[in-house]
């Protein structure tokens, strides 16, 4: 099956006040991470992958203590990530004059969890409080969702996706990316 | 008329590779990204990845990860599908399609399908 | 991967006939449903895109519905041309993925 290489057991702790994690800085906007150079991921970040071909929508770990106030889990947790490229660029670049927009040449695709599951975890509270229960949301695995020009920006926001180039005459589509850095693709798998 | 005229019929022996080529003609090559898709015999069709004309970055299913390499020619618009290591199961017609789009809808669809390329694998 | 289920697999019918053909798949996959029209030795054909849209020069006759897992193509009067096999295709989540075909025959 297509996702067969992606998925494992590793899982995703997500508190239960309603947000994601802040995914690490190095997720967010990092053009390093486009770059064929640095293997698809940031150079010098404790991540590992099962799928180690670039620009693919895989599931990133990295450990960390759930916490809530003063209050932490007696274990840190793996943690999930979905990150990376579905497929090769869908955005072409077209010149008009002087002026750059960019112009569609498939849908897009957004890698983002697929599947979760819940798990509870205990937290120790400093002061001799009693220990805490908290449940939390797991991601299991990950996805190329078709993303529209409809969704909006602060959605990308929340995937730490690109900013959005606005396209002459309609609305902004996500994900667009020079032509320069398409240079750096290589393959892709879904 | 925007067309897709794709290579011959090819037998080839388990182990293998074969290379299928795809001619457009009637649109703007790099415009649109290239996919291709498979049908064995009597089967549905399998669709196998896609190639950015313009940056050569290619996506596959992963299904075919590591045995398929999608290319192409910008100066003759021709794509191109590399499978190797055959096998029996690899007997199909291989197809190369070209999508197309709604703006109102925001939405694709393979439009336009070359004729399709026989491909045999057989001792 | 998302799997696409069509029923019924083959189905005999008469010119004139009203046929309803249903793809179902294995998760919402809002209305980026595709379907496409196959006759033998030949490259499929677009007839529907985003469940119900008509391409340009398909016969009215042809209708598309549903939203989310549950699709379905209508023929309201079959026609000669028609017989052949016919495939939904989803286009939410990669990889693309066909349903197994209908092959509609002459009874």
């Known amino acids: 099956q297509g996702w067969q290489a992606f998925k494992n057991d590793a899982t995703e702790i997500i508190p239960e006040l309603g947000e994601y994690p802040e995914p690490p800085p190095e997720l967010e906007n990092n053009k390093t991470m486009n770059r064929a150079e640095n293997g698809g991921r940031p150079p010098h970040h404790p991540f590992e992958t099962k799928d180690v071909s670039e620009y693919s929508c895989r599931e990133l770990h990295f450990t960390r203590y759930v916490t809530d106030g003063p209050c932490r889990s007696a274990k840190p947790v793996t943690e999930l990530v979905c990150s990376g490229q579905c497929g090769p660029a869908r955005l072409l670049p077209n010149a008009i004059g002087r002026g750059k927009w960019w112009r569609p040449s498939g849908p897009d695709f957004r890698c983002i969890p697929d599947r979760y599951r819940a798990q509870r975890v205990q937290l120790l509270c400093p002061g001799g409080e009693a220990p805490r229960a908290r449940k939390v949301r797991l991601v299991a695995s990950c996805k190329c969702k078709r993303l529209t020009r409809f969704h909006n920006q602060s959605e990308l926001k929340d995937f730490g996706t690109e900013a959005a180039r606005p396209q002459k005459g309609r609305k902004p589509r996500p994900r667009a990316r020079s032509a320069k850095a398409n240079q750096a693709e290589l393959e892709n798998a879904y | 008329e925007v067309q897709l005229v794709q290579s011959g019929a090819e037998v080839k022996k388990p182990g293998a590779s074969v290379k299928v080529s795809c001619k457009a003609s009637?649109?703007?090559?790099?415009?649109?990204?290239m996919h291709w898709v498979r049908q064995a015999p009597g089967q549905g069709l399998e669709w196998m990845g896609e190639?950015?004309?313009?940056?050569?970055?290619?996506g596959y299913n992963q299904k075919f990860k590591g045995r398929v390499t999608m290319t192409t020619d910008t100066s003759t618009s021709t794509a191109y599908m590399e499978l190797r290591s055959l096998r029996s199961d690899d007997t199909a017609v291989y197809y190369c399609?070209?999508?197309?789009?709604?703006?109102?809808?925001?939405?694709?669809?393979?439009?336009?399908w070359g004729q399709g390329t026989t491909v045999t694998v057989s001792s | 991967d998302i799997q696409m289920t069509q029923s019924p697999s083959s189905l005999s019918a008469s010119v004139g006939d009203r046929v309803t053909i249903t793809c179902r798949a294995s998760?919402?996959?809002?209305?980026?449903l595709n379907w496409y029209q196959q006759k033998p030795g030949k490259a499929p054909k677009l007839l529907i895109y985003?469940?119900?849209r008509l391409l340009s020069g398909v016969p009215s006759r042809f209708s598309g519905s549903g939203s989310g897992t549950d699709f379905t193509l209508t023929i309201s009067s079959l026609q000669p041309e028609d017989f052949a096999t016919y495939y939904c295709?989803?286009?939410?989540?990669?990889?693309?993925?066909f349903g197994g075909g209908t092959k509609v025959e002459i009874k």
């Open positions: 009637g649109y703007t090559f790099t415009d649109y990204n």
């Open positions: 985003h469940t119900s």
């Open positions: 190639i950015n004309p313009n940056s050569g970055g290619a």
């Open positions: 295709q989803q286009g939410d989540t990669l990889p693309y993925t």
């Open positions: 998760q919402d996959i809002s209305n980026y």
């Open positions: 399609a070209r999508l197309g789009y709604d703006d109102i809808y925001d939405d694709w669809y393979f439009h336009v």
